[in-house]
């Protein structure tokens, strides 16, 4: 696995321990918490990153209305079980034997149950809607410039193929970034939209996962863009299975309807 040879660090993941013990004395980096070897030339999977995090010390409406099956991550942090490839296992359980099913981005998609709960397959999140509100700026943002800059960011910083950035919507001060990636579209070596979205989410919270980089400096024609709040909606290839109790207001977070629970990152 490639890493910076000179000082043996992982450019794409600061939550690693690196040493020159790879083949031929090459630098090899392992994720904290799991010890899994990671490829430092690309993004680390969200599952391994969450595990590492838990192991560390503690007018015309142009905006998208999230689908009724959209999920928002209200459960917060947990210590996930990852498969050997670093993907989330379909079933997650806590220390008290409470279990639930998750999608490919690790967000719960069923009611919580006990150890008898079955999660037949890891359901893929194929559509992610990142909803941002930027803070007021001295200079206005031009939609096409903003679109180009956000596409550049996902391509260059997160190494996400441009075809997976489906759209960028802007209705001041709200920006929406739509990421779409079906199972059939994702080729070997492609960054997963869930991982790109997670890196972006951490960046806009001022918690960059990249090694040795300062905070993300995002500019549109030189004008800095500052994010005041972030909401991320996840849509799965198969709709989630929640009880009617949750659908009629039993869920947490005070959202307006269904699973649109506002999860404020700032």
């Amino acid at each position: 696995h490639t890493a910076a040879q000179d000082n043996c660090t992982c450019p794409t993941n600061k939550m690693t321990v690196c040493s020159p013990d790879g083949p031929g004395g090459r630098c090899q980096c392992r994720a904290l918490g799991s010890g899994v070897a990671v490829d430092c030339s690309t993004l680390t999977s969200k599952c391994l990153l969450l595990k590492a995090r838990m192991s560390a010390p503690k007018n015309a409406r142009t905006l998208v209305r999230p689908n009724e099956h959209a999920l928002v991550d209200n459960d917060g942090l947990y210590d996930p079980d990852c498969d050997p490839e670093g993907r989330f296992k379909a079933r997650q359980c806590n220390q008290t034997s409470v279990c639930w099913c998750v999608n490919s981005v690790g967000v719960r998609r069923t009611d919580k149950g006990d150890l008898s709960l079955r999660c037949d397959e890891l359901v893929r999140t194929h559509h992610i809607l990142i909803d941002l509100r930027h803070r007021p700026t001295a200079g206005a943002f031009n939609h096409s410039d903003l679109d180009a800059e956000l596409r550049r960011l996902f391509r260059e910083r997160y190494r996400l193929h441009p075809k997976f950035v489906a759209a960028v919507h802007y209705e001041q001060p709200t920006i929406q970034i739509e990421l779409r990636q079906n199972t059939s579209q994702k080729a070997a070596g492609d960054v997963d939209i869930g991982d790109a979205a997670y890196y972006f989410e951490r960046d806009v919270k001022g918690e960059s996962l990249f090694q040795g980089r300062g905070g993300l400096d995002l500019r549109v024609r030189g004008e800095p863009l500052q994010v005041e709040r972030t909401l991320i909606y996840y849509l799965d290839e198969i709709p989630p299975k929640f009880s009617m109790k949750r659908l009629t207001g039993g869920g947490s977070g005070g959202g307006s309807h269904h699973h649109h629970h506002h999860h404020h990152h700032h």
């Epitope: 905070g215 030189g222 994010v227």
Partner: antibody, heavy 122, light 106 residues
Framework: QVQLVQSGAEVKKPGASVKVSCKAS????????INWVRQRPGQGLEWMGW????????KYNEKFKGRVTMTVDTSTSTVYMELSSLRSEDTAVYYC???????????????WGQGTLVTVSS | EIVLTQSPATLSLSPGERATLSCSAS?????IYWYQRKPGQAPRLLIY???NLASGIPARFSGSGSGTDFTLTISSLEPEDFAVYYC?????????FGQGTKVEIK
């Protein structure tokens, strides 16, 4: 540490132009914009504009539009501010200052260059 | 153009006293920045985003306010704090500064 070093004092005749340089060090030059602010004798601070070295974007104070030109030389990490058609009221100390910003916050103008005194006199 | 009016123009105090400097904006702004300028020196950033202390600035400096009224407070004046203080807005172009408040030794 982050440092901005400006060129020395200048004396100019009315109608002439002056070009002040600001050399940056101690940070990734292309990641922050450089602002120019002046202070006339006995007056307050007056913002002139900024330039963003990564793509050359700039924003000028309308008051100086047509007279001010900001340029950048990334090979030497230097920003230039040229003011033309000088008049006596342009006599001032001219400062460059870095504005650091991330998606989280705008961290203000920090640090500032030591200032360049430009005297316009016939 | 947003006009920032600082008051008082001059504040005469003794070391150890509390200094309260005001900055009033002609229209609502989201954040205010405060700078200190000593004779013969370049300005120095004290406070960014209204209330956040810049790197290396002592904790006796604090900022507060919202909308059109903002305050810089120095809890207990040290001899090196006697200087001119400027507020600045980044809400709309042109960026503007207040005319300054001079804090002098009484």
């Amino acid at each position: 540490q982050v440092q901005l070093v400006q060129s020395g004092a200048e004396v100019k005749k009315p109608g002439a132009s002056v070009k002040v340089s600001c050399k940056a060090s101690g940070y990734t030059f292309t990641s922050s914009d450089i602002n120019w602010v002046r202070q006339r004798p006995g007056q307050g601070l007056e913002w002139m504009g900024w330039i963003y070295p990564r793509d050359g974007s700039k924003k000028y104070n309308e008051k100086f539009k047509g007279r001010v030109t900001m340029t950048v030389d990334t090979s030497t990490s230097t920003v230039y501010m040229e003011l033309s058609s000088l008049r006596s009221e342009d006599t001032a100390v001219y400062y460059c200052a870095r504005r650091f910003a991330t998606v989280v916050s705008n961290y203000g103008l920090d640090p500032w260059g030591q200032g360049t005194l430009v005297t316009v006199s016939s | 153009e947003i006009v920032l009016t600082q008051s008082p123009a001059t504040l005469s105090l003794s070391p150890g006293e509390r200094a309260t400097l005001s900055c009033s904006a002609s229209s609502s702004v989201n954040y205010i920045y405060w700078y200190q300028r000593k004779p013969g020196q370049a300005p120095r950033l004290l406070i960014y985003d209204t209330s956040n202390l810049a790197s290396g600035i002592p904790a006796r400096f604090s900022g507060s306010g919202s909308g059109t009224d903002f305050t810089l407070t120095i809890s207990s004046l040290e001899p090196e704090d006697f200087a001119v203080y400027y507020c600045q807005q980044w809400n709309s172009y042109p960026l503007t500064f207040g005319q300054g408040t001079k804090v002098e030794i009484k």
